[in-house]
């Protein structure tokens, strides 16, 4: 015997209180698949989050981060502060890369310069806080 709720499309819920008719999701909620018995609350992009895609009756809202921050985690679950190139984010804020390390992005950590001698090469262009060394022949 087929479940009558399976006929309810995305954007609706199967209303058990009304002989399992398909009722539209309330505002600020959605159902992305058919046959659901409830709708899900839409994600709200507040504070440092901003709305990249509005919630609809069939899909959740999508957030990204306000300028000066970048997304972390699945579905942009967190926003992390940007730093400048040549810096990394620490508990005390953005700090310059130590000598011998670099970061060419606004996120992530400072990484050591390439050791050219390990490949039997010499340094062609010196490294900076923002750029790795360039190895030569």
């Amino acid at each position: 015997l087929q479940d009558p709720c399976s006929n309810c499309p995305a954007g609706t819920f199967c209303d058990n209180n009304r002989n399992q008719i398909c009722s539209p999701c309330p505002p600020n909620s959605f159902s992305s698949a058919g046959g659901q018995r409830t709708c899900d609350i839409c994600r709200q992009c507040k504070g440092v989050f901003r709305t990249r895609k509005e919630c609809s009756s069939t899909s959740n809202a999508e957030c990204d981060c306000t300028p000066g921050f970048h997304c972390l985690g699945a579905g942009c679950s967190m926003c992390e502060q940007d730093c400048k190139q040549g810096q990394e984010l620490t508990k005390k804020g953005c700090k310059d890369c130590c000598f011998g390390t670099f970061n060419d992005q606004k996120r992530g950590i400072c990484r050591p310069w390439t050791n050219c001698s390990l490949d039997g090469k010499s340094v062609l262009v010196n490294g900076t806080k923002e750029r790795d060394v360039v190895c030569g022949p």
């Epitope: 819920f13 309330p26 505002p27 609350i41």
Partner: nanobody, 122 residues
Framework: EVQLLESGGGLVQPGGSLRLSCAAS????????VGWVRQAPGKGLEWVSA????????YYAESVKGRFTISRDNAKNTLYLQMSSLRAEDTAVYYC???????????????RGQGTQVTVSS
């Protein structure tokens, strides 16, 4: 017991106005997310308007934006829908509804009244 009693419907000419009322009992209207749904002849339910987040934001269906206004009187525990510039396609039974938030995180809605018939015709 939760009760919702709608009134104010009737027959009106295109371009006319009506004000629907919903008297609530058994719960405090101002502490709930509430609104109006409608069912046109031969069609499914459609959300028309709602007051969400304890009175913070309002929702209007695209088809009624700029024509309908939702409000509530907390002292009278009554919800209103002011309808203007009415069109034939607004003909429907209008129900007062309460959004229900379930413990597991799901959302549904509940409407207990008989609804009020709005007919827009010349």
């Amino acid at each position: 017991e939760v009760q919702l009693l709608e009134s104010g419907g009737g027959l009106v000419q295109p371009g006319g106005s009506l004000r629907l009322s919903c008297a609530a009992s058994g719960f405090t209207l101002s502490a709930e997310d509430v609104g109006w749904v409608r069912q046109a002849p031969g069609k499914g339910l459609e959300w028309v308007s709602a007051i969400l987040d304890f009175g913070g934001s309002t929702y209007y269906a695209e088809s009624v934006k700029g024509r309908f206004t939702i409000s509530r009187d907390n002292a009278k525990n009554t919800l209103y829908l002011q309808m203007s510039s009415l069109r034939a396609e607004d003909t429907a039974v209008y129900y007062c509804a309460r959004v229900v938030y379930h413990a597991g995180g799901g959302v549904t809605f509940d409407y207990r009244g008989q609804g009020t018939q709005v007919t827009v015709s010349s």
